[in-house]
């Protein structure tokens, strides 16, 4: 008995398309191996008409494709546009046609409903409008116009000209009767039901010379489209329903059990927590459409979506609506990386933000996740030199350690930077990650004076004390610019005093600064790195004045003037031009988000990344 | 909610024929995948099989068990779902259940179920 199972029979009509899935038990060998649909001939023969390994049949040319789900064990053939020709018995099967590891599948295709004569037919989608035209001849203008339902062998009256409504209309029907220069009535329904779908008589006056007209109505509800994505990686769901709802309440939700259906984001505000921090719902255009993005997609991610439309934000029966079916594949080509990053106040992180290695030249951004109204995420720093104006001197984007991975370094931080931020790039918009830095109780790790004031022409010293634990990592100062830090020398003066239980492998490490000048005035980090890995970083901002008195600086510890959570650093917002924000690969198909606070920054929307690991502020 | 309701078990000769009803009823606008499953005495539930549908197309599955012998069909109308059994052998002894979701991953595990009936008795006596 073959272990491959699927549907035995597959009964359609016309003009249709049919999604026939076919389940294997999911072996690594199984997984991998080609997956064929073929059309059994009268002699015993099975002719491939799609496999898996790209070969499409001229008879399925534009109409077919085969899509194999290998964590579940599945692949699903999709034919479209069917016809009776297409009627006959079927094999879904692995391996070799002719090898037995395969399924029968009868497929049927009929002409359709057996429709009377002059029956006008009407497809629509589920929550959506109909319109159907009743014409009438002069006779029967002043006479009641009606529209009844079959309903098994009874018309069942829906509505009349005299103002009855169906119990099962309420509210959503009604009877237009045009000027008296048409000879026609309309009956509009909306908020459509699977259960509005049959046959319809619309008539005119109710002798034997009242006009009547046959109408079918096929109500669809939407084929989930199959969305494919990788475990920490990111999906977008578009969502257009049509202009008629372009003011009504947007949501997006997950089917659970039954006709559940729990919001997973609404325009109301609603937003499940298990999204909190990775998901942004796009403003929507004047025709109503919108897109969600779901970033660090997780195994239980997988699943039924619905975006619909209702004044309750939620899914109600009648709601228009769209469908996906996602599935989260485990073997994921994008990278483990940390979810968390803890830092400490007056303390630093880096981050290390995960991009398709294939695309090392696109430029690299980090955005702040915001939960308010549907979610944004303005653009804190980018790969080509701008800084977000609140973020200069403490925040940088390093194409190290490259070959997949940035980094972005943050310090100076404060309880108000705890919050969720998104690495993305103008590339693959699939890599999306997100990180969740975490503000905990402690000290930072390196110790520098607060700010410091650099006299002209003469010679400043700045020390930055490294406790024993950094033994190990190499030491550095830089200069911050909005394009990175550039190293500057410095002298490592030997064993630090600054720590309490610290051997001698602490290090004091000082930034020289000789005849300084007006250029020299700035930010300057302390840090440390193992290679192109980046750790803990301390900042230091320099002033330079006029000469005083003569003689060089030598700053101590002691002299620090504020800690440097406490440096409000007010220098003007650069304007960003909006090419950056409206760069049309930034998102693919996803919208900047922004709103007026902080149009001048250029805000842009960005991404995200899942597992359950953590990341302290000076590891790896 | 939906409620599921089977009808038309009984006591019958093996080589007999029965059909089993399971009629829904409550909001059953989105529920597209019914099925029945059945239990034998002292076994775990197993698939019979499972109808589906989406707009005018219908998606059949059996088990091998009952291939050629057992039939599922609908009356969208009525919200039933029908089990023709044909040939039926001791071993179709068992309580048939009808169970019924708006989406299955596999039509075949119990648990993707999320609605299900009482249950109808079928005993097939040699």
């Known amino acids: 008995k073959s272990p491959i199972f699927g549907p035995e029979e597959v009964n359609s009509v016309e003009g249709n398309s049919v999604s026939i899935t076919c389940y294997y038990p999911p072996t690594s060998v199984n997984r991998h191996t080609r997956k064929y649909w073929c059309r059994q001939g009268a002699r015993g023969g099975c002719i491939t008409l799609i496999s898996s390994e790209g070969y499409v049949s001229s008879k399925y040319a534009g109409r077919a494709n085969l899509t194999n789900f290998p964590e579940n064990g599945t692949f699903v053939v999709n034919i479209a546009q069917l016809s009776q020709d297409d009627s006959g018995r079927y094999k879904c099967g692995l391996g070799i046609n002719s090898r037995g590891l395969s399924f029968d599948v009868s497929l049927e295709v009929s002409q359709g409903p057996g429709l009377l004569n002059d029956t006008k037919v009407y497809t629509v989608d589920l929550g959506r409008t109909v319109t159907i035209n009743c014409p009438f001849k002069t006779e029967n203008a002043q006479k009641r116009k009606s529209l009844y339902k079959q309903i098994g062998l009874y018309p069942v009256l829906v509505i009349d000209s005299s103002g009855y409504v169906n119990p099962n209309y309420t509210g959503r029907i009604r009877l237009d009767i045009q000027g008296t220069g048409q000879l026609l009535f309309s009956v509009v329904i909306n908020q459509l039901r699977l259960s509005d779908a049959g046959q319809y008589l619309c008539q005119a006056g109710d002798d034997s010379n009242s006009n009547k007209k046959n109408a079918d109505l096929q109500v669809l509800k939407p084929e989930p489209e199959l969305v494919y994505e990788d475990l920490r990686g990111s999906v977008t769901f578009h969502c257009a329903l049509g202009p008629e709802v372009a003011n009504v309440a947007k949501f997006l939700c997950r089917q659970s059990s039954g006709e559940n259906c729990d919001v997973v984001v609404n325009t109301l505000g609603k937003r499940a927590p298990a999204f909190e921090g990775r998901i942004l719902l796009n403003p929507q255009d004047k025709d109503g459409s919108f897109s969600v993005v779901i970033t660090g997609l997780r195994k239980e991610d997988a699943g039924r979506y619905l975006c619909g439309a209702h004044s309750d934000g939620q899914l109600q029966e009648g709601s228009p609506i769209q469908a996906w079916q996602l599935f989260v594949n485990e073997e994921s080509t994008i990278p483990r990386s940390p979810t968390v990053v803890k830092g400490v106040a007056g303390g630093s992180v880096a981050v290390l933000c995960p991009y398709n290695r294939k695309e090392s030249k696109s430029i690299k951004y980090w955005c702040l996740w915001e939960g308010a109204q549907n979610g944004r995420c303005p653009l804190l720093v980018d790969s080509e030199g701008w800084v977000k104006a609140q973020y200069e001197g403490r925040l940088s984007l390093l194409e190290e350690p490259g070959n997949g991975t940035f980094t972005v370094i943050l310090n100076q931080l404060t309880s108000r930077d705890a919050g969720f931020y998104w690495c993305l790039t103008n590339g693959d918009t699939l890599w999306r990650t997100t990180v969740e830095i975490k503000i905990i109780e402690g000290e930072p790790n390196l110790k520098v004076p607060g700010n410091v004031t650099a006299v002209l022409g003469e010679t400043l010293k700045v020390p930055c004390h490294f406790p024993c634990k950094f033994s190990s990592y190499e030491k550095y100062w830089c200069k911050w610019n909005n394009t990175g830090c550039q190293a500057l020398p410095s002298q490592d003066e030997g064993p630090s005093k600054a720590f309490v239980n610290c051997d001698e492998n602490s290090r004091l490490v000082s930034l020289t600064l000789n005849l300084v000048t007006r250029a020299d005035e700035g930010w300057y980090w302390c840090g440390v790195k193992q290679g192109h890995f980046y750790g803990e970083t301390a900042a230091v901002y320099v002033a330079v004045e006029e000469r005083k008195a003569a003689g060089s600086r030598d700053v101590s510890l002691a002299k620090a003037d504020a800690a440097p959570d406490e440096k409000v650093l007010d220098s003007g917002f650069r304007e960003i031009e909006n090419k950056a924000i409206q760069d049309p690969r930034l998102f693919a198909e996803e919208k900047a988000v922004a709103d007026t606070r902080d149009q001048a920054d250029g805000s842009r929307a960005s991404v995200d990344s899942g597992s359950s690991e953590e990341q302290g502020g000076s590891s790896r | 909610q939906v409620q599921l309701v089977e009808s038309g078990g009984g006591l019958v000769q093996a080589g007999d024929s029965l059909r089993l009803s399971c009629a829904a009823s409550?909001?059953?606008?989105?529920?597209?995948?019914m099925g029945w499953f059945r239990q034998p005495p002292g076994k775990e539930r197993e698939f019979v099989a499972t109808i589906s549908w989406s707009g005018s197309t219908t998606y059949k599955y059996y088990a091998d068990s009952v291939k050629g012998r057992f039939t599922i069909s609908r009356d969208n109308a009525k919200n039933t779902v029908y089990l023709q059994m044909n040939s039926l052998k001791p071993e179709d002894t068992a309580v048939y259940y009808c169970?019924?979701?708006?989406?299955?991953?596999?039509?075949?595990?119990?648990?993707?179920?999320?609605?299900w009936g009482q249950g109808t008795q079928v005993t097939v006596s040699s």
């Open positions: 169970a019924a979701s708006t989406v299955v991953a596999d039509p075949r595990a119990p648990n993707e179920y999320d609605y």
């Open positions: 409550g909001r059953t606008f989105t529920t597209y995948v």
